[in-house]
Interface confidence: low
């Protein structure tokens, strides 16, 4: 099984114990590590952070001791903007320039492949996204001709039904991608006006979302039925939680909220908590399991957080094994307890290790 793990370059800027550099990563934990994110400037793939090249080096030296480890560079992301991607992909010349720039950049910096994180193609971009993937793969095949190992090509896809329908020709893009990471999280957010888990495995009777599509099981099943081969589908598991501020004395699933939860001490983003911040939060909190959805949430005062723990990730891994998927994807290593100092287990990366162990279990 693949264990595809994202590392985010901006995690270096978190304060104190929240700061994470690639040299803190465990070289034997994941089969693939994806560095997020690269930029595109003047139609060429480019660095994003001022010290990206240094960080690329740190990451890729992990392969010295584990030659089986593969590293990929992810291009795009939330801050990149869908419009910029759209302009490049829809223009033949821009697309060709971008595609041509990728292999030398990856080779120079020691990466084994590219991950496309176009978040998200619009309805009119669907065909262009397919073309981009098809042409990128063709370039990788051609570039590898002189006996080099072919560069890998993957994509991170939304798990939302509406986005899947409008953005992706699943059957076609699956032919050209080496694997697909399906982002089976962020199904529920503060915009709904109620509490709800952002990454349920199944749609439990408790689910307050207005449809039957907002769960991992549905998204995976939908992708499979739209033509994604199980052997290429990698299921996303979050090492972060989504939090809410309760608006009343109700604390269950579907309770009214006044907005996102208060920012974490290190991640400093309202409505999001890293797993290591959740471990802190759990001291003195009340933990509940949403039985049908097979995930936990915790409440303390007027704060509510839905998250994944070692038990829920094991359930998710069992599920992906039952569906014969290619493996699991983790967003993100730097949101797990990467130092092993927060969650009281004396273990670095407790969630990702639980996923790894569950994948290895017979």
């Amino acid at each position: 099984y693949k264990l595809v793990c994202y590392y985010t370059s901006w995690s270096q800027y978190r304060e104190g114990d929240g700061s994470c550099f690639p040299d803190a990563l465990d070289r034997f934990l994941c089969t693939h590590i994806i560095y997020s994110f690269a930029n595109i400037s003047n139609d060429h793939i480019d660095t994003w952070e001022w010290n990206d090249v240094t960080l690329y080096g740190m990451l890729n030296t992990l392969k010295n001791r584990n030659p089986n480890l593969k590293t990929l560079l992810s291009v795009g992301g939330w801050n990149f903007g869908s419009q910029r991607f759209s302009k490049i992909a829809s223009n033949t010349q821009s697309r060709r320039t971008f595609i041509k720039s990728v292999p030398p950049f990856l080779r120079t910096h020691g990466f084994d492949g590219l991950d496309l994180a176009w978040l998200y193609p619009g309805r009119r971009d669907k065909q262009h996204f397919t073309t981009l993937i098809k042409e990128m793969k063709a370039e990788f095949i051609k570039e590898a001709q002189p006996g080099k190992k072919q560069l890998l090509l993957s994509a991170a896809l939304s798990a939302g039904k509406v986005t899947i329908d409008s953005s992706y020709d699943i059957a076609k893009i699956s032919q050209h991608l080496d694997f697909i990471s399906i982002m089976t999280y962020d199904f529920h957010g503060a915009w709904r006006g109620t509490t709800g888990h952002h990454s349920p495995l199944f749609r439990g009777q408790e689910d307050a979302s207005p449809d039957r599509f907002s769960n991992t099981d549905y998204a995976v099943g939908y992708m499979l039925r739209l033509g994604a081969p199980a052997s290429k589908l990698v299921m996303g598991i979050p090492t972060f939680g989504r939090s809410f501020t309760l608006a009343s004395s109700e604390t269950g699933v579907g309770a009214p909220i006044s907005g996102p939860g208060i920012p974490g001490r290190f991640t400093k983003e309202a409505g999001t908590l890293a797993y290591y911040e959740i471990c802190d939060f759990l001291r003195g909190a009340t933990v509940h399991r949403i039985l049908g959805q097979q995930v936990p949430y915790a409440t303390k005062g007027n704060q509510w957080v839905g998250y994944d723990d070692q038990e829920s990730v094991k359930s998710k891994v069992q599920y992906l094994k039952d569906r014969q998927l290619a493996g699991a994807m983790v967003w993100a290593l730097d949101l797990d307890d990467f130092q092993g100092s927060f969650c009281g287990q004396d273990l670095r990366f407790p969630l990702t290790n639980a996923i790894k162990d569950a994948l290895a279990a017979t």
Epitope: K161, R203, Y222, R225, G292
Partner: antibody
Framework: QSVKESGGDLVKPGASLTLTCTAS?????????ICWVRQAPGKGLEWIAC????????TYYASWAKGRFTISKTSSTTVTLQMTSLTAADTATYFC????????????????WGPGTLVTVSS | AIKMTQTPASVEVAVGGTVTIKCQAS??????LAWYQQKPGQPPKLLIY???DLASGVPSRFRGSGSGTQFTLTISGVECADAATYYC????????????FGGGTKVVVE
């Protein structure tokens, strides 16, 4: 391919009854949802419950049916509806029906129906 | 909870005529609406799904339209065989609903 309901009977108020839906020519795989719908004499259709045959955890009930009705997948070709504390208002023809989705993501539509089984609750 | 309201409850139409049945959802259901036909002593039959797509084997005189909260079933060139009760059904969600079906419209062909 067909489905057929069985188990309908004349029972007294307060009694319990289990109806069975049996598939022929196909099995209840992950591609299907199976639902129960009832129709009181001379009245309209009333949805009771559905189960995702591929994930038996996924059961959904009409708000009025929760607690008194239980839908279960009992084998690869049978789904049951257990009914408790029956009253005269539960007198109806009970239909079992299969969701039409060949591809997941279409709405929840029922394109394969059984002939129905009559449940009469009377003292 | 989504509530489906169907109008009229009953309608008479001459052979060859046109009949229009309306269905209103209490909140948006996108295009996830189906129409069924039911004749006495028989189970319902799926006619239209996704608001406007004809189910297999359904004649083209049946036409569905609408999205969001307002939907219409139109039967043109009505035949005697079309005498039945017609139900709309929202297929958007089965969470926290009392009934997915509308109340029904009885079509009497003269």
């Amino acid at each position: 391919q067909s489905v057929k309901e069985s188990g309908g009977d004349l029972v007294k108020p307060g009694a319990s009854l289990t109806l069975t839906c049996t598939a022929s020519g196909f099995s209840f795989s992950s591609s299907y949802w199976i639902c129960w719908v009832r129709q009181a004499p001379g009245k309209g259709l009333e949805w009771i419950a559905c189960i995702d045959a591929g994930s038996s955890e996924s059961t959904y009930y009409a708000s009025w049916a929760k607690g008194r009705f239980t839908i279960s997948k009992t084998s690869s070709t049978t789904v049951t509806l257990q009914m408790t504390s029956l009253t005269a208002a539960d007198t109806a023809t009970y239909f079992c029906a299969r969701d039409s989705r060949v591809v997941a993501g279409v709405g929840m539509y029922l394109n394969l129906w059984g002939p129905g089984t009559l449940v009469t609750v009377s003292s | 909870a989504i509530k489906m309201t169907q109008t009229p409850a009953s309608v008479e139409v001459a052979v060859g005529g046109t009949v229009t049945i309306k269905c209103q959802a209490s909140q948006s259901i996108g295009i996830y609406l189906a129409w069924y036909q039911q004749k006495p002593g028989q189970p319902p039959k799926l006619l239209i799904y996704d608001a406007s797509d004809l189910a297999s084997g359904v004649p083209s005189r049946f036409r569905g339209s609408g999205s969001g909260t307002q939907f219409t079933l139109t039967i043109s060139g009505v035949e005697c065989a079309d005498a039945a009760t017609y139900y709309c059904q929202q297929g958007d969600t089965i969470y926290n609903v009392d009934n997915t079906f509308g109340g029904g419209t009885k079509v009497v062909v003269e």
